[in-house]
Interface confidence: low
């Protein structure tokens, strides 16, 4: 059994354009043509002076995180595809990336998938409607928000000096005035006014695998959901956030683990 | 070279106890999970144990669970296989095998060690 | 338990002929990941049994091209092409998606 191994198949990277708004998940997908008996992943972005910076990396059934957490690996469960994401992307996470397999002794080869380009855009504050908005119909909502403000400002300017003459041409009519409500009768809320507080659960992993021995890092994102539970009515802790952030999910079997083979 | 070393293999009475020994060299031993094999004479293979590369998880086969405990030393590079209330059917040649996986496991056995349990 | 029925017991051929072992599983040993989880082994006499084919036809490293494996589902073939005297010794199908993982009762190569 010592003839050579048969030759390192190549690696795939996709898309190879990838567009985000900030604060969104960005993932690009690695894969091997074949599943490698032993083998070491890395995940890379081009620098500006075309040298490869190493963001994260896959090794035998163990993820090694880079220095920045939000660079995460996930292999899938046909061993084949890597899922590499970029957590809340930002702007300057703009950029070429590309991911390399090192298949390991006895016939140690390297090997570079194609690059990919990643555009992270500035986010609206608005979502972007069908049609665009024409300017002009833009210049006129502002125009009227100007007049309205002057108009008010205006208003507000000439009641001043209305009081200022009456105070001074009926200087005794104003001294006994109260200004204030009834002493019986305090201001009113609405008939539903109950006040309504929030318990803000963060992000919450909702998830039912088993623990495996990868560093704990949230899973990917089509398995996280966003909570917020609404209690109308009189609170226990009124203004008080509880967070649930740290109930941290189990991430998926490793591939060393096999398809479930632990039952625990 | 991966290589999986055994020991501790012996001839024991029933009800007795044995601890087999898997010396690794030649890859990250840390990285990956582990498994016991075992082989009767003129008989076919059966997995006995497994455990994850962090040693937090196991698997036994049925006939073994509760007499068997599998363990590693990820400092030292050592799985490790205590055999208590052991019985004659335990009688085999006893595999270290590198990984427990579908994918890439079961890719290197090591010498096996015997463990004979007669009166 | 998931029963593996190897077929021949025992095969005997002449160097540079073509060897064919089957497996047949009881169960499907797809997984819903489009994997099917079944390897081979070869076991030399007094030796530990070395892998030589898993996930069905993937080869282990060092392993020669003359090795390939095939099929799908409950069904499965290894054959050897330009046999060897080396290629004797005990063949072994398993399965590792059902939970106990079992394996084949062995063929047994020999040259004529």
């Known amino acids: 059994l010592d003839s050579p191994d048969r030759p390192w198949s190549p690696l795939t990277f996709s898309p190879a354009q990838l567009t985000v708004q900030e604060g969104e998940n960005a993932t690009f997908t690695c894969s091997l043509a074949d599943i490698p008996d032993s083998f070491v992943l890395n995940w890379y972005r081009l620098s500006p002076r075309n040298q490869t910076d190493k963001l994260a990396a896959f090794q035998e059934d163990r993820i090694e995180p880079g220095r920045d957490r939000r660079f995460r690996v996930t292999r899938l469960p046909n061993g084949r595809d890597f899922h590499m994401s970029i957590v809340a992307a930002r702007l300057n996470d703009s950029g070429i990336y590309l991911c390399g397999a090192i298949y390991l002794p006895p016939n140690t080869q390297i090997n570079e998938s194609p690059r990919a380009e990643l555009s992270v855009t500035e986010r609206t504050l608005e979502p972007p409607t069908q049609s665009p908005s024409p300017p002009p119909r833009l210049s006129g909502q502002l125009q009227g928000l100007v007049i309205g403000v002057t108009s008010v400002l205006v208003g507000v300017l000439l009641l001043l000096l209305l009081t200022w003459v009456l105070a001074a041409v009926f200087p005794r009519a104003t001294r006994g005035a109260c200004v204030c409500g009834s002493e019986d009768e305090p201001l009113k809320e609405g008939p539903d006014a109950a006040p309504v507080f929030t318990l803000d659960y963060g992000e919450l992993d909702f998830q039912w695998r088993e623990k495996t021995p990868e560093p704990p890092a949230p899973c990917a994102p089509e398995q996280t959901e966003y909570a917020t539970i609404v209690f109308p009515g009189r609170p226990a802790s009124p203004g008080r956030r509880a967070s649930a952030s740290s109930l941290q999910g189990a991430q998926p079997p490793s591939p060393e683990d096999g398809p479930g083979l632990w039952p625990l | 070279e991966v290589q999986l070393v055994e020991s501790g293999g012996d001839l024991v009475k029933p009800a007795g106890s044995l601890r087999l020994s898997c010396l690794a060299s030649?890859?990250?031993?840390?990285?990956?999970?582990m498994s016991w094999v075992r082989q009767a004479p003129e008989k076919g293979l059966h997995l006995v144990a497994g455990?994850?590369?962090?040693?937090?998880?196991?698997y036994y086969k049925d006939a073994v669970k509760g007499r068997f405990t599998i363990s590693r030393d990820n400092a030292k590079s050592i799985v490790y296989l205590q055999m208590n209330s052991l019985r004659v059917e335990d009688t085999a040649m006893y595999y270290c095998v590198r990984g427990f996986s579908s994918f890439n496991g079961l890719g290197y056995w090591g010498q096996g060690t015997l463990v004979t349990v007669s009166s | 338990d998931v029963v593996m029925t190897q077929t021949p017991l025992s095969l005997s051929v002449s160097p540079g002929e073509t060897a064919s072992i089957s497996c047949k599983a009881s169960q499907s040993l797809l997984h819903s990941d489009g994997n099917t989880y079944l390897t081979w082994f070869r076991q030399k006499p007094g030796q530990s049994p070395h892998r030589l084919v898993y996930a069905v036809s993937h080869r282990h490293p060092g392993v020669p091209d003359r090795f390939s494996g095939s099929g799908s589902g409950t069904d499965f073939t290894l054959r050897i092409s330009r046999v060897e005297a080396d290629d004797t010794g005990l063949y072994y199908c398993?399965?590792?998606?059902?939970?106990?993982?079992?394996f084949g009762a062995g063929t047994k190569v020999e040259l004529k």
């Open positions: 455990i994850n590369s962090d040693g937090d998880r196991t």
């Open positions: 030649g890859f990250t031993f840390s990285s990956y999970s």
């Open positions: 398993g399965q590792v998606i059902h939970d106990p993982w079992t």
